[in-house]
């Protein structure tokens, strides 16, 4: 696994312990909580990051209206079960044997049940809508400059292929970033949109996951872009299955 050889650290994940005990004395980094070896040349999966976090000593408008099937992560943090590749297991359960099904970004997509609950497959989240509100500025940002800056950010900081950034919408003070990635589009080695969105979310909150790098300093033509609110909507390839009680609540 690639890691900075000079001092054996993981540039893309500070929630690791790295030691020169890999093959041939190479640096090997293991995610806190799970102990899984991670590839430090790319983003770590959201599942392993959440597990590490839990183990640590915590209409005519251009804007998109989220679909009726869009999920928002209202359940907050939990200690997830990850598969050997670091992906979320389709079924998650807590200490009291309450279980639920999740999508590929770990967001609950069914009502909660007991241990008999079946989650046949991990349903892929293929469309992520990141909804941001920026702090007041002297004037609106130039849309094309903003678009270019956010695309550059996802390409350079999160290593997300540009084709997966479907659109950047802007209506002051709301910015929306649309990420799309179908199962068929994702090739081996491609960063997952769910992982990129999670790194971005943590960056926006001032909780960068990168090792030793400064926090996110977003600027558009030199003007700081300061985010004061973030909402992320997740759309799955198969719509979620909630009871009518929840849908009408």
């Amino acid at each position: 696994h690639t890691a900075a050889q000079d001092n054996c650290t993981c540039p893309t994940n500070k929630m690791t312990v790295c030691s020169p005990d890999g093959p041939g004395g190479r640096c090997q980094c293991r995610a806190l909580g799970s102990g899984m070896a991670v590839d430090c040349s790319t983003l770590t999966s959201k599942c392993l990051l959440l597990k590490a976090r839990m183990s640590a000593p915590k209409n005519a408008r251009t804007l998109v209206r989220p679909s009726e099937h869009a999920l928002v992560d209202n359940d907050g943090l939990y200690d997830p079960d990850c598969d050997p590749e670091g992906r979320f297991k389709a079924r998650q359960c807590n200490q009291t044997s309450v279980c639920w099904c999740v999508n590929s970004v770990g967001v609950r997509r069914t009502d909660k049940g007991d241990l008999s609950l079946r989650c046949d497959e991990l349903v892929r989240t293929h469309h992520i809508l990141i909804d941001l509100r920026h702090r007041p500025t002297a004037g609106a940002f130039n849309h094309s400059d903003l678009d270019a800056e956010l695309r550059r950010l996802f390409r350079e900081r999160y290593r997300l292929h540009p084709k997966f950034v479907a659109a950047v919408h802007y209506e002051q003070p709301t910015i929306q970033i649309e990420l799309r990635q179908n199962t068929s589009q994702k090739a081996a080695g491609d960063v997952d949109i769910g992982d990129a969105a999670y790194y971005f979310e943590r960056d926006i909150k001032g909780e960068s996951l990168f090792q030793g790098r400064g926090g996110l300093d977003l600027r558009v033509r030199g003007e700081p872009l300061q985010v004061e609110r973030t909402l992320i909507y997740y759309l799955d390839e198969i719509p979620p299955k909630f009871s009518m009680k929840r849908l009408t609540a």
């Epitope: 312990v17 030691s19 020169p20 005990d21 890999g22 093959p23 090997q28 293991r30 806190l32 909580g33 799970s34 102990g35 899984m36 070896a37 598969d83 050997p84 590749e85």
Partner: antibody
């Protein structure tokens, strides 16, 4: 030559605690994980947890989480494993082991801990 | 946690025979498996890492194979000193776990 030398055998009463030491030499102490593995008489091997001496990060097997504490002293290149609230089923040989690649390459000689009233 | 199941529990063979020991993981662990030999009163000795990579100083008659969930340790021709207990161990994720062991005894 890499060496892991453990403290001597201990006899303890139920409810007591035991602290086993493991002194490392022949390599950079802070660079490699030290794991603790135990083996009850006639039984198999059981991983208890590990410590990374560089920053004292510890990870414990859930089975022992509330009773085990692993610490290190970099000045003496020594790792300690303390197990509290001892019971008869804790009678075992306790090994420290240094981890390399995918295996436990170096082992201490083992420390027999006997729990008896 | 990842459960490792070793079979058979006991293998009765004669010197010169070939020994085939199996280790099955409860989930895919790639090649994150190691094999150990343990003799009475001694600490375990690492034989194989990464499922198939031999450790320097270990005789060439010991070899490992497999990936995913099924792994095998083969001793091509048993020597008298090879009669011992053999354990597999996974290091894919914490908690690290060992198989229950296979005892290779003289027939």
């Amino acid at each position: 030559e890499v060496q892991l030398v453990q403290s001597g055998a201990e006899v303890k009463k139920p409810g007591a605690s035991v602290k086993v030491s493991c002194k490392a030499s022949g390599y950079t102490f802070t660079s490699y994980w030290i794991n603790w593995v135990r083996q009850a008489p006639g039984q198999g091997l059981e991983w208890m947890g590990n410590i990374y001496p560089s920053n004292s990060y510890t990870n414990y097997n859930q089975k022992f989480k509330d009773r085990v504490t692993m610490t290190r002293d970099t000045s003496t290149s020594t790792v300690y494993m303390e197990l509290s609230s001892l019971r008869s089923e804790d009678t075992a040989v306790y090994y420290c082991s240094s981890y390399r690649s995918e295996g436990f390459a170096y082992w201490g000689q083992g420390t027999l801990v006997t729990v008896s009233s | 946690e990842i459960v490792l199941t070793q079979s058979p529990a006991t293998l009765s063979l004669s010197p010169g025979e070939r020994a085939t020991l199996s280790c099955r993981a409860s989930q895919n662990i790639g090649t994150s498996i190691a094999w150990y030999q343990q003799k009475p009163g001694q600490a375990p000795r690492l034989l194989i890492e990464f499922a198939s990579e031999s450790i320097s100083g270990i005789p060439a008659r010991f070899s490992g194979s497999g990936s995913g969930t099924d792994f095998t340790l083969t001793i091509s021709s048993l020597e008298p000193e090879d009669f011992a207990v053999y354990y597999c161990q996974q290091s894919n994720s914490w908690p690290f776990t060992f198989g229950g062991g296979t005892k290779v005894e003289i027939k």
